[in-house]
């Protein structure tokens, strides 16, 4: 983690590779996994629409003790608006419904390959 | 209310050793990456160590092999161990919350620390 | 290691006077992943410990007042206060927070004449 994703050329990127960074994060994870994500820990599940990049990080922020998410999370705080802190709730997130992180994030996987096949970069 | 209070400091000899301690309250404790910041006399700021909510720990390199940075989540408490103490380590020493995600974004009132024979 | 150079490293102004203040890094602080800025800006009055004023280039902190701007990207970054209030008094250091080490710049000290 230390040089955190490399040093990126002056200017602004294309959402796109903004986009596809975070889905090879969230790839490598899915791939790389052995034990059981940040020890099976559980967090709130999230309706995959707009507002998800923060209600992903309202999520993710409050598993502690897990490095395996935490270039996720810094990548997540940029896609959202506003800083997120741990113990903060949307709308977006299902309040009922807790599920593994690694769970999490094969869904949050598959719903951004979607977004990037369609071409819904923001 | 988020609150950072350092605690420890103190005059020591050249190659000594102190323990600073940072009690946070207000907040998630366990959920945010932790730094230690020192301000010298001539009021530089230096990044000295930083332990994130994953665990991982990074160091400048003018206090690695020196210092330890630690947390203990149970009692929302940041540590740093000090040791081989040298006269440039004088300085204000700050716990600052955050760094890795955001910037950081709260800290405490400081502890002076001088080393000197 | 990045390294951040701010300039002035002084200046003395009135009240009322817009401010701007710059800080350059050696290397680029976009991170291609979120493209965003990992630079902050901080404020210390005499006695006091630093207050975070903006972090990701110009995002505002919460709380703090609207005549404090930041802009830039990539390696240029500037401070901006755009009617200097007396409390203003206080040195402003900028920060890289895109990679380990974090590094500060040396400060630029703001004046009441």
């Known amino acids: 983690l230390t040089c955190l994703g490399g040093f990126a050329s002056p200017g602004p990127v294309p959402p796109s590779t903004a986009l596809r960074e975070l889905i090879e994060e969230l790839v490598n994870i899915t791939q790389n996994q052995k034990a059981p994500l940040c020890n099976g820990s559980m967090v709130w599940s999230i309706n995959l629409t707009a507002g998800m990049y923060c209600a992903a990080l309202e999520s993710l922020i409050n598993v502690s003790g897990c490095s395996a998410i935490e270039k996720t999370q810094r990548m997540l705080s940029g896609f959202c608006p506003h800083k997120v802190s741990a113990g903060q709730f949307s709308s977006l997130h299902v309040r009922d419904t807790k599920i593994e992180v690694a769970q999490f994030v094969k869904d949050l996987l598959l719903h951004l390959k979607k977004l990037f096949r369609e071409g819904q970069f923001n | 209310e988020v609150k950072l209070v350092e605690s420890g400091g103190g005059l020591v000899r050249p190659g000594g050793s102190l323990k600073l301690s940072c009690a946070a309250s207000?907040?998630?404790?366990?959920?945010?990456?932790m730094n230690w910041v020192r301000q010298t006399p001539e009021k530089r700021l230096e990044w000295v160590a930083s332990?994130?909510?994953?665990?991982?720990?990074y160091y400048s390199d003018s206090v690695k092999g020196r210092f330890t940075i630690s947390r203990d989540n149970a009692r929302n408490t940041l540590h740093l161990q000090m040791s081989s103490l040298r006269s440039e380590d004088t300085a204000m020493y700050y716990c600052?919350?955050?760094?890795?995600?955001?910037?950081?974004?709260?800290w405490g009132q400081g502890t002076s620390v001088t080393v000197s024979s | 290691d990045i390294v951040m150079s701010q300039s002035p490293s002084s200046l003395a102004v009135s009240v009322g006077e817009k401010v701007t203040m710059s800080c350059k890094s050696s290397?680029?602080?976009?991170?291609?992943?979120?493209?965003?800025?990992?630079l902050a800006w901080y404020q210390q009055k005499p006695g006091q410990s630093p207050k975070l004023l903006i972090y990701?280039?110009?995002t505002r902190e919460s709380g703090v007042p609207d005549r404090f701007t930041g802009s830039g990207s990539g390696t240029d970054f500037t401070l901006t206060i755009s009617s200097v209030k007396a409390e203003d008094l206080a040195v402003y250091y900028c920060?890289?927070?895109?990679?380990?080490?974090?590094?500060f710049g040396s400060g630029t000290k703001l004046e009441i004449k």
């Open positions: 600052a919350r955050d760094g890795y995600l955001y910037a950081m974004d709260y």
């Open positions: 920060q890289q927070y895109y990679s380990y080490p974090f590094t």
């Open positions: 207000g907040f998630t404790f366990s959920s945010y990456a």
């Open positions: 990701w280039a110009s």
């Open positions: 332990i994130s909510s994953g665990g991982n720990i």
């Open positions: 290397q680029n602080l976009l991170y291609s992943s979120n493209q965003k800025n990992y």
